[in-house]
Interface confidence: low
């Protein structure tokens, strides 16, 4: 049986919030609590953007904030993959990328983030309230999925700009000694809590847990903390899912040779426009699912030939070939 633990993702600060400094003393303990609980816990962020130039064109960007190695990324729409969602793209760090209409261009932006451009018209066109989900399978963390959609009132071409991440990427955390800072923060938090002992503590709501408890990990937060931070898994039902895709793949994956566009995919003409790794922008909602490999029945990542990183981000395929320069 698959074990799922719901963990809230950290949202970026809302731009233009006034009086934030005045509330710092109230906010600080909760920020520290969140950091203490989520320390070492992977996060997935999703950003959905509608292009101003083409109203039926969407850009989905997803990233994994974790220290593990990513073995597979699955992008779906209409709900989480395996729960009514339709697969749009599968990105494997060693073995390539598969995409299905209306996905136009799926690519790696960094070792831990991907982007996907969708375009379409009529039945295969995404619409404003479509839910897009990204699932990152990593080792040893397991599978983590996040979903996002455009905010209802969003203007074409506008989504919250990727905010510089207020939290450090987990793979850099160890290097930068964030663990020490968090430890200090946790101690400070305990100190604050002891000072405010006289205040009644908010009652914890029991969390929805699956029958099988998650396998314990050294950095796993306590049950109480998990309960305190638990958020329900949110998905948006949409009427925009393409019937053409649903009928094309009764077995879960579309018949890619039947549904793919015949024209060549448009390629970005340069390195990724987004240099920093953002966390979810406004208008995106995030939910995270964790399934350990042993429990989810997933494979550990394949270890193939030694991989090398290349200075030219476009690679040789910008001008030629399936094996070379396009």
């Amino acid at each position: 049986m698959r074990t799922e633990a719901q963990v809230p993702a950290l949202q970026p600060p809302e731009p233009g919030l006034e009086g934030a400094m005045g509330h710092r003393t109230l906010v600080l303990p909760w920020v520290l609590l969140t950091l203490c609980v989520t320390a070492g816990t992977p996060e997935v962020w999703v950003q959905v953007r509608m292009e101003a130039t083409e109203l039926s064109s969407f850009t989905i960007r997803c990233g994994f904030l974790g220290s593990g190695s990513i073995s597979l990324v699955t992008v779906s729409w209409g709900g989480p993959n395996g729960a009514g969602g339709t697969t749009l793209a599968v990105l494997h760090p060693e073995r390539g990328i598969r995409q299905w209409a209306p996905a136009r261009q799926a690519r790696w932006e960094t070792q831990s983030s991907i982007s996907l451009i969708l375009e379409g018209s009529g039945a295969s066109s995404p619409c404003a309230n479509t839910t897009f989900c990204c699932k990152f399978a990593s080792f040893p963390e397991g599978s983590w999925e996040a979903c996002g959609s455009l905010p209802p009132s969003s203007d074409p071409g506008l989504s919250a700009p990727p905010t510089p991440a207020p939290i450090l990427r987990a793979d850099l955390a160890g290097i930068l000694g964030v663990s020490g800072v968090l430890l200090f923060g946790c101690v400070y938090l305990l100190h604050l809590l002891r000072r405010h002992k006289h205040r009644p503590a908010p009652r914890l709501q029991p969390s929805r847990t699956s029958p099988q408890a998650p396998r314990a990990r050294a950095w796993a937060p306590s049950q109480a903390s998990q309960a305190a931070l638990h958020v329900p898994y949110a998905t948006i039902n949409t009427s925009c899912r393409p019937a053409t895709l649903d009928t094309a793949h009764p077995h879960g994956g579309p018949s890619w040779w039947a549904s793919l566009p015949t024209h060549a995919a448009h390629r970005p003409q340069g390195p990724a426009a987004w240099a920093s790794t953002p966390i979810p922008a406004r208008g995106s909602f995030v939910s995270v699912e964790n399934g350990l490999y042993a429990q989810a029945g997933e494979r550990p990542p394949h270890t193939g030939p030694g991989l090398t990183l290349f200075p030219d981000p476009r690679g040789p395929r910008a001008m030629e070939g399936p094996l070379g320069v396009r």
């Epitope: 390539g96 995409q99 261009q105 390629r267 030629e320 320069v325």
Partner: antibody
Framework: QVQLVQSGAEVKKPGASVKVSCKVS????????MHWVRQAPGKGLEWMGG????????IYAQKFQGRVTMTEDTSTDTAYMELSSLRSEDTAVYYC??????????????????WGKGTTVTVSS | DVVMTQSPLSLPVTPGEPASISCRSS???????????LDWYLQKPGQSPQLLIY???NRASGVPDRFSGSGSGTDFTLKISRVEAEDVGVYYC?????????FGGGTKLEIK
């Protein structure tokens, strides 16, 4: 570990078609980029075509354009290569091979790192 | 198409001795990112080909370190520092810079 299991030997008459299958195990087909390579008796290797993940399309070598069709059944994790209008010079061993992927990012470079055992196709009248 | 030419056609070697196979391409396989898009494969008798070297000089997983690839542009070499009996077979170079990828004619390594 990826494994590719190919269908058995075929004997065909000139003008007929042959469909060779390649079953993937250890991974799902959607995680791989499948290529097909053939080898005529006593001759070298010849790339016929393969899946191009950047386009999401299959690309065929010019020589086989119009005669070859490469398809996949994701429900059974099986890839197929169909060659039509067979001639005697199509007598060969046909291999399926997965295209390895070197590095993430916007970089797509392929090498055939896992091969099937091959399917012998004999075209004879 | 890029034409790949291998030499020698046949290479008899004594076990323990070194061996060298040459591969020449009709156009440069060096791309602006500094990589040479050339791979080496070995096809042992009665078997499928197996990847030995990719990107000119990178050994594939599980390949013994007695195999090494070198060269740049149009001239490439596969070296075996000490040939063993299990190394017999036909060695192919393949260019991966342009579509379609093309293979050399092969070099048959045999034990003396």
């Amino acid at each position: 570990q990826v494994q590719l299991v190919q269908s058995g030997a075929e004997v065909k008459k000139p003008g007929a078609s042959v469909k060779v299958s390649c079953k993937v195990s250890g991974y799902t087909l959607t995680e791989l980029s499948m290529h097909w390579v053939r080898q005529a008796p006593g001759k070298g290797l010849e790339w016929m075509g393969g899946f191009d993940p950047e386009d999401g399309e299959t690309i065929y070598a010019q020589k086989f354009q119009g005669r070859v069709t490469m398809t996949e059944d994701t429900s059974t994790d099986t890839a197929y290569m169909e060659l039509s209008s067979l001639r005697s010079e199509d007598t060969a061993v046909y291999y399926c091979a997965t295209g390895g992927y070197s590095s993430g990012f916007n970089y797509y470079y392929y090498y055939m790192d896992v091969w099937g055992k091959g399917t012998t196709v004999t075209v004879s009248s | 198409d890029v034409v790949m030419t291998q030499s020698p056609l046949s290479l008899p070697v004594t076990p323990g001795e070194p061996a060298s196979i040459s591969c020449r391409s009709s156009q440069s396989l060096l791309y602006r990112n500094g990589n040479n898009y050339l791979d080496w494969y070995l096809q042992k008798p009665g078997q499928s080909p197996q990847l030995l070297i990719y990107l000119g000089s990178n050994r594939a997983s599980g390949v013994p370190d007695r195999f090494s690839g070198s060269g740049s542009g149009t001239d490439f070499t596969l070296k075996i520092s000490r040939v063993e009996a299990e190394d017999v077979g036909v060695y192919y170079c393949m260019q991966a810079l342009q579509t379609p990828p093309t293979f050399g004619g092969g070099t048959k390594l045999e034990i003396k």
